[in-house]
Interface confidence: low
């Protein structure tokens, strides 16, 4: 058993039929010695008496809020949550496996630049009695600070018969060093509590591996005289790290016909302009990627040819 | 050329070669995301590699203040990786394919380190740890780890030289 926060405790249980469970001793937080009784949740029945209460925790019915009283007055509470371990593996019932970039990916994180700010998100089909708490650090043995905000519900989607809820959190490394080569990964830890079930999820990454720039901005076309060619120009996204002479991007320019089946023409360039042939009804799209480290491409920025 | 005496490097040449190094490092090990190398044990094998750290002056302000700190750190790293790529980790079994970019990568690391430190000048270099994995599969895993680490190192070096070429060239 360990304390998650004040008066909230997590009991770790091997989860299999007829498992012995855990013996837990609860102590009433009071100077009183006599006349103390215990209840669980809203029970009117007294579970036991005395300053300490020893219980066998085997299943969710044994978890919940234990309260000690004296003379009709509440003295203290202890909330017990369960963390299940099945076949040596901690349960992952609360969050959905996003399967990208690989199986057992529950948390996904992205950064728009090298400032040490990043966003993580996760999915669940649970809509009520659900709380999340997020902690993060750089490295684990001698952790350096990363500050995370509160997790918030950021999207709701209907998937078949089910509703899916997306939660996200923003974190910022306290002493970020954008130009350094990371040697210790960022660790993100999410505590999830659904009713009386506790689970924790972790992700470990370097900022450089989760970089995904915003799309290029101010995408413009300038027709070239007496030619089917156009000059496409764009700018670095506002959210990208500066100076751009140091944090450089590379770009992919694509000419795409109306039909998805039509051949796409692609040009790669380090410049913020390119000359392409603009076909009728086609559109021109540009996306960006870190010039020196192959992390994710941005989403496309597009303009029609006409 | 960046010599220990403090004159400036050939920023543009360094920029071109470091950008080529980035391309080669990624073509040598393009499998991003398919294998989380940090999950594999064996941490001590790659945590001795020299990293470009916050205090090394490789950020824009640090380069403007005194680029020598940073260039020395980059030089140390280039020599370190050049030795690793020439060691039995890469020369031993399983043999690299004849058209593997590792050979080019090795040569380019040497080329850039020589641009930074001509003959006759010596910055102190870091000792390379004695890594001789016994099993071919261990060697393969170690190659991946070294290449992943090299990708990160050369990315920072390329940024330094690109910025130097754009802002510090005479």
């Amino acid at each position: 058993i360990w304390e998650l926060k004040k008066d909230v405790y997590v009991v770790e249980l091997d989860w299999y039929p007829d498992a012995p469970g855990e013996m837990v001793v609860l102590t009433c937080d009071t100077p009183e010695e006599d006349g103390i009784t215990w209840t669980l949740d809203q029970s009117s029945e007294v579970l036991g008496s005395g300053k300490t209460l020893t219980i066998q925790v085997k299943e969710f019915g044994d978890a919940g809020q234990y309260t000690c009283h004296k003379g009709g007055e509440v003295l203290s509470h202890s909330l017990l949550l369960l963390h299940k371990k099945e076949d040596g593996i901690w349960s992952t019932d609360i969050l959905k496996d996003q399967k990208e970039p690989k199986n057992k990916t529950f948390l996904r994180c992205e950064a728009k630049n090298y400032s040490g700010r990043f966003t993580c998100w996760w999915l669940t089909t649970i809509s009520t009695d659900l709380t999340f708490s997020v902690k993060s650090s750089r490295g684990s043995s001698d952790p350096q600070g990363v500050t995370c905000g509160a997790a918030t519900l950021s999207a709701e989607r209907v998937r078949g018969d089910n509703k899916e809820y997306e939660y996200s959190v923003e974190c910022q490394e306290d002493s970020a060093c954008p130009a350094a080569e990371e040697s210790l990964p960022i660790e993100v830890m999410v505590d999830a509590v659904h009713k009386l079930k506790y689970e924790n999820y972790t992700s470990s990454f370097f900022i450089r591996d989760i970089i995904k720039p915003d799309p290029p901005k101010n995408l413009q076309l300038k027709p070239l005289k007496n030619s089917r060619q156009v000059e496409v120009s764009w700018e670095y996204p506002d959210t990208w790290s500066t100076p751009h002479s140091y944090f450089s991007l590379t770009f992919c320019v694509q000419v795409q016909g109306k039909s998805k089946r039509e051949k796409k023409d692609r040009v790669f360039t380090d410049k913020t302009s390119a000359t392409v042939i603009c076909r009728k009804n086609a559109s021109i799209s540009v996306r960006a990627q870190d010039r020196y480290y192959s992390s994710s491409w941005s989403e496309w920025a597009s303009v029609p040819c006409s | 050329r960046a010599v220990p005496g403090g004159s400036s490097p050939a920023w543009t040449q360094c920029q071109q070669l470091s950008q080529k190094l980035c391309t080669l490092a990624w073509s040598a090990h393009p499998l991003v995301g398919h294998m989380d190398l940090r999950e594999e044990g064996d941490e001590e094998t790659t945590n001795d590699v020299p990293h470009i750290q916050c205090g090394d002056g490789c950020d824009p302000q640090g380069l403007r203040d005194n680029s020598q700190f940073c260039l020395q750190r980059i030089h140390q790293g280039l020599i370190f990786y050049e030795k690793l790529l020439g060691s039995d980790i890469f020369t031993g079994e399983p043999s690299l394919l004849p058209d593997s970019p590792v050979g080019q990568l090795h040569a380019s690391l040497l080329g850039l380190s020589q641009l930074l430190q001509p003959e006759g000048h010596h910055w102190e270099t870091q000792q390379i740890p004695s890594l001789s994995p016994s099993q071919p599969w261990q060697r393969l895993l170690l190659r991946f780890k070294i290449l992943r680490s090299l990708q990160a190192f050369v990315a920072v070096a390329a940024r330094v030289f690109a910025h130097g070429a754009a802002t510090l060239s005479p």
Epitope: S175 | S7, S8, Q61, R64, D65, N66, T167
Partner: antibody, heavy 113, light 107 residues
Framework: QSVEESGGRLVTPGTPLTLTCTVS????????MSWVRQAPGKGLEWIGV?????SAYYASWAKGRFTISGASTTVDLKITSPTTEDTATYFC??????????WGPGTLVTVSS | DVVMTQTPSSTSAAVGGTVTIKCQAS??????LSWYQQKPGQRPKPLIV???TLASGVPSRFKGNRSGTEYTLTISGVQREDAAAYYC?????????FGGGTKVVVV
């Protein structure tokens, strides 16, 4: 290795004045050089810096009022049109964020009619 | 420009006591922050560079610390010779600014 400012004197308002920072024992193309001033009895005030590539950057209040330029062993600070508020000791400093930071002794500029 | 807000503007300490001076940057400035000591009629002397690195020849009683955009200079075991004005200097990569200064009196 040292830096020394010179050129400080009494000038009348509106008369341009150039201060010179002379360095010895190190190369200017390896260091940034900053100009800082301090009015009598007041705090330090950062004016601007010249970087390794010769680009100069200024505090927003100093733009247009000062010009920093560099040569092989000197860095100049030109006060374009001095006012009485520019009366101060002017310091030249090498690499203000680095361990091998060096400051000159300062040169006094008095602007008075 | 980055604005450096330095507190307090003056403070006093007994010999052997501790002095803490803070500088708050108006935006993220990474570890680009220096602390200077200046005695009357003298040039500024660097104490701490890059937020927490002790400048050469500076006694170990001077310590620099950073938390987010708040920077702290702590003098532990204050000596008589520590009576001086102290300034922080912070920058965003191109443009810098000094804090308003803190006068330290040793009693």
């Amino acid at each position: 290795q040292s830096v020394e400012e010179s050129g400080g004197r009494l000038v009348t308002p509106g008369t341009p004045l150039t201060l010179t920072c002379t360095v010895s024992g190190f190369s200017l193309n390896s260091y940034s050089m900053s100009w800082v001033r301090q009015a009598p009895g007041k705090g330090l005030e950062w004016i601007g810096v010249i970087g390794l590539g010769g680009s100069a950057y200024y505090a927003s209040w100093a733009k247009g009022r000062f010009t920093i330029s560099g040569a092989s062993t000197t860095v100049d600070l030109k006060i374009t049109s001095p006012t009485t508020e520019d009366t101060a000791t002017y310091f030249c400093a090498r690499a203000t964020y680095s361990d091998d930071n060096i400051w000159g002794p300062g040169t006094l500029v008095t602007v008075s009619s | 420009d980055v604005v450096m807000t330095q507190t307090p503007s003056s403070t006093s300490a007994a010999v052997g006591g501790t002095v803490t001076i803070k500088c708050q940057a108006s935006q993220s400035i990474s570890s680009w922050l220096s602390w200077y000591q200046q005695k009357p009629g003298q040039r500024p002397k660097p104490l701490i560079v890059r937020a927490s690195t002790l400048a050469s020849g500076v006694p170990s009683r001077f310590k620099g610390n950073r938390s987010g955009t708040e920077y702290t200079l702590t003098i532990s075991g204050v000596q008589r010779e520590d009576a001086a004005a102290y300034y922080c200097l912070g920058g965003d990569g191109n443009v810098s600014n000094f804090g308003g200064g803190t006068k330290v009196v040793v009693v």
